[in-house]
Interface confidence: medium
């Protein structure tokens, strides 16, 4: 309970993109679905689908911010071959520019809110997961927030 | 040095359609998009829409959903854009210009315009 | 779609001294503590040119003459002080949201 209360702060406190987020179209879960086969299953903030398959909870808001952020970071770190400052801030100009503009919108709202810390994350050579994790876009495998 | 040249002036008739191009170069053209903006005699800017000239996608201001369309040949480096049905108001300078940031939306890099006058 | 106001449309100004460009949006244009507002230089006959940044980020290549400052709706482009290659015509544009927008203009002359 503790657990679920503390997941609708963090959501609250995350502002609201979901806004955008729950609009998305088939091609932004096929670009984000590439991304997540090990991924996913660690993540405790990726809900399942509500019976009626239309109802969206904070955590499944919060499990699509954490779809998206996997996907822009992957895709930053093949990107650049060697994680710096430069190369990574270089790269992060241009990360959101393949795919539809809806997936556009969607990773420039993202960037324009994380990029800072994404950059610092790779550059310290923390994994896609950990950088997600820490921007509080799901609870970290670990244990509880 | 970036540069983006765009076609020379134009003079066409009412009804009629006009493709205007933006070489660029000095840069991987592929890695920015291209903006169109629309400046009418004595008039502010107007913006047209973009396109991503690495996969051709493109995001356009409704206003001008139907009247521009913009398309980009990678082995040349250019961008164009196609207006159609021309009337009196299209009459106007149209620039094209780089968008140096992707997630940001300033234009960094201007062409130098391309005038199209629509008259009988 | 978000419109911008430029106030004053016109302004002379002695060299040397301050000008101050306002630029008011009708709707914030604020994203996660970024603002997405930009100033342009455009002189006759020639295409506009990128001055300011995401509000207050100078372009490279542009004198330290230049500034900007505000957020949420109201911002300002100061030249201080102005020179006689300044007089030009100043807009605002917002890239917060679609469709990106620009203010009507100040054209800046010199007394």
């Known amino acids: 309970m503790a657990t679920w209360a503390l997941l609708l702060l963090a959501a609250m406190l995350l502002g609201n993109p979901g806004l955008v987020f729950s609009r998305l179209s088939p091609e932004y879960y096929d670009l984000a679905r590439a991304h997540l086969r090990d991924e996913e299953k660690s993540c405790p903030c990726l809900a399942q689908e509500g019976p009626q398959g239309d109802l969206l909870t904070k955590t499944q808001e919060l499990g699509r911010d954490y779809r998206t952020c996997l996907t822009i970071v992957q895709k930053l770190k093949k990107m650049v071959d060697k994680p710096t400052q430069r190369s990574v801030s270089n790269a992060a100009t241009r990360v959101c520019r393949t795919g539809r503009s809806r997936w556009r919108d969607v990773c420039r709202n993202f960037m324009r809110r994380y990029q800072s810390r994404v950059t610092q994350g790779l550059v310290a050579g923390e994994t896609a997961q950990q950088i997600c994790e820490d921007l509080r876009l799901c609870i970290p495998s670990t244990g509880p927030l | 040095q970036v540069k983006l040249q765009e076609s020379g002036p134009d003079l066409v008739k009412p009804g009629a359609s006009v493709k205007i191009s933006c070489k660029a170069s000095?840069?991987?053209?592929?890695?920015?998009?291209i903006n169109w903006v629309k400046q009418r005699p004595g008039q502010g800017l107007e913006w047209i829409g973009w396109?991503?000239?690495?996969?051709?996608?493109?995001k356009y201001n409704e206003k001008f959903k139907g009247k521009a369309s913009l398309t980009a040949d990678k082995s040349s480096s250019t961008a164009y854009m196609l207006l159609n049905s021309l009337t009196s108001e299209d009459s106007a300078v149209y620039f094209c210009?780089?968008?140096?940031?992707?997630?940001?939306?300033?234009?960094?890099?201007w062409g130098q315009g391309t005038t199209v006058t629509v008259s009988s | 779609d978000i419109e911008l106001t430029q106030s004053p449309t016109s302004l002379a100004v002695s060299l040397g001294q301050r000008a101050t460009i306002s630029c008011r949006a009708s709707?914030?244009?604020?994203?996660?503590?970024?603002?997405?507002m930009y100033w342009y230089q455009q002189k006759p006959g020639q295409a506009p040119k990128l001055l300011i940044y995401?509000?207050?980020n100078l372009e490279s290549g542009i004198p330290a003459r230049f500034s900007g400052s505000g957020s949420r709706t109201d911002f300002t482009l100061t030249i201080n002080p102005v020179e006689a290659d300044d007089v030009a015509t100043y807009y605002c544009?917002?890239?917060?949201?679609?469709?990106?927008?620009f203010g009507g203009g100040t054209k800046l002359e010199i007394k």
């Open positions: 000095g840069y991987t053209f592929t890695n920015y998009d």
């Open positions: 709707e914030s244009v604020d994203s996660y503590g970024d603002s997405f």
């Open positions: 544009q917002q890239s917060n949201e679609y469709p990106y927008t």
């Open positions: 995401r509000t207050s």
């Open positions: 396109i991503d000239p690495g996969d051709g996608s493109t």
């Open positions: 210009a780089r968008v140096g940031n992707d997630y940001d939306g300033g234009f960094d890099f």
